[in-house]
């Protein structure tokens, strides 16, 4: 058992038929040494008596608030949450597995710049009596600090007949330095309650390894005289790292026709600006990816050709 | 009519055991939760321990210590209290309740503890 916040605490439980379950000793807080009784939750049903009270703890029945009282009065509280292991894993109930890059991928995180700041975000089919709390740091053994701000709801989905809650999570590492390698990874932890269930969530990562430009912006299209050719031109998302001469992007800039089926024409460039063929019906998109190490493009910013 | 009858006191040696019956009648204990409580000489009564339904997932008293343990057998209809480690100051008479106010409790069995 441990504390996660004043009065709340989690007892871990290997989570299997006929479990012995935990003995807790619940203590309760005054001075008081007598006549104290103990309930739990709502129930009026007594549970015990005595300033400490040792109770066994093996199912969600066991868990919730244990409040002791004296004579009518409410002396203190006690939550209890249950955080299950089954077969040696903690349990995984409360977030969906968004299977990318990998399988077991709960927490999924990005980075537009290297200024430190990033975005975590998660899925969940549960809409109610459900709380997060993030914490981060970079490295675990000596910890530099990261901020992070409250886990709020961004987005709804219907997903077949359910649905789908996305929840996100803004952090900023203190003492960001953008042009340094990175030794040491960011962690980033999720305590996830939902009713009397306690889990966490971890990742880890490089914010090299997380980063994803924005789009492109301006992108604009300049016909050349006497030819089917345009010059394409566009500039880096004011979100992207500066100075633009160290913090380098490359870019691919694509023509597709009206039909996906269409052949795709892409062209690379390290260049703002392109020249390529626009076809009747077609659009040109270009997207950003950083040029000294691959991590994931952008999304795609376009253009009509008419 | 709702019953309860305990079986199993005796005089017994410190360090010794002892294991307490309380068989029911006329409810089923696995529908509620059930209570040992002991009076010793002069005293008032003492809650000692409590079997929850479901799971029977259970609380004792901080001078039990890890010595008592509370079980139910819900076949036989029958709760048991199994006393290890038994010192002088648990000398007393044991009963048990239906409810935390002893409205449905049995006539007790005595234990004592003495060399």
């Known amino acids: 058992i441990w504390e996660l916040k004043k009065d709340v605490y989690v007892v871990e439980l290997d989570w299997y038929p006929d479990a012995p379950g935990e003995m807790v000793v619940l203590t309760c807080d005054t001075p008081e040494e007598d006549g104290i009784t103990w309930t739990l939750d709502q129930s009026s049903e007594v549970l015990g008596s005595g300033k400490t009270l040792t109770i066994q703890v093996k199912e969600f029945g066991d868990a919730g608030q244990y409040t002791c009282h004296k004579g009518g009065e409410v002396l203190s509280h006690s939550l209890l949450l249950l955080h299950k292991k089954e077969d040696g894993i903690w349990s995984t109930d409360i977030l969906k597995d968004q299977k990318e890059p990998k399988n077991k991928t709960f927490l999924r995180c990005e980075a537009k710049n290297y200024s430190g700041r990033f975005t975590c975000w998660w899925l969940t089919t549960i809409s109610t009596d459900l709380t997060f709390s993030v914490k981060s740091s970079r490295g675990s053994s000596d910890p530099q600090g990261v901020t992070c701000g409250a886990a709020t709801l961004s987005a709804e989905r219907v997903r077949g007949d359910n649905k789908e809650y996305e929840y996100s999570v803004e952090c900023q590492e203190d003492s960001a330095c953008p042009a340094a390698e990175e030794s040491l990874p960011i962690e980033v932890m999720v305590d996830a309650v939902h009713k009397l269930k306690y889990e966490n969530y971890t990742s880890s990562f490089f914010i090299r390894d997380i980063i994803k430009p924005d789009p492109p912006k301006n992108l604009q299209l300049k016909p050349l005289k006497n030819s089917r050719q345009v010059e394409v031109s566009w500039e880096y998302p004011d979100t992207w790292s500066t100075p633009h001469s160290y913090f380098s992007l490359t870019f691919c800039v694509q023509v597709q026709g009206k039909s996906k089926r269409e052949k795709k024409d892409r062209v690379f460039t390290d260049k703002t600006s392109a020249t390529v063929i626009c076809r009747k019906n077609a659009s040109i998109s270009v997207r950003a990816q950083d040029r000294y190490y691959s991590s994931s493009w952008s999304e795609w910013a376009s253009v009509p050709c008419s | 009519e709702m019953q309860l009858v305990e079986s199993g006191g005796g005089l017994v040696q410190p360090g010794g055991s002892l294991r307490l019956s309380c068989a029911a009648s006329?409810?089923?204990?696995?529908?509620?939760?059930m209570y040992w409580f002991r009076q010793a000489p002069g005293k008032g009564h003492e809650w000692v321990s409590t079997?929850?339904?479901?799971?029977?997932?259970?609380a004792y008293a901080d001078f039990v210590k890890g010595r008592f343990t509370i079980s139910r057998d819900n076949a036989k209809n029958t709760l048991y209290l199994q006393m290890n480690s038994l010192k002088p100051e648990d000398t007393a008479l044991y009963y048990c309740?239906?409810?935390?106010?002893?409205?449905?409790r049995g006539q007790g069995t005595q234990v004592t503890v003495s060399s």
């Open positions: 006329g409810f089923s204990i696995s529908n509620n939760w």
């Open positions: 309740a239906r409810d935390w106010a002893g409205t449905v």
């Open positions: 079997i929850k339904t479901g799971a029977g997932s259970t």
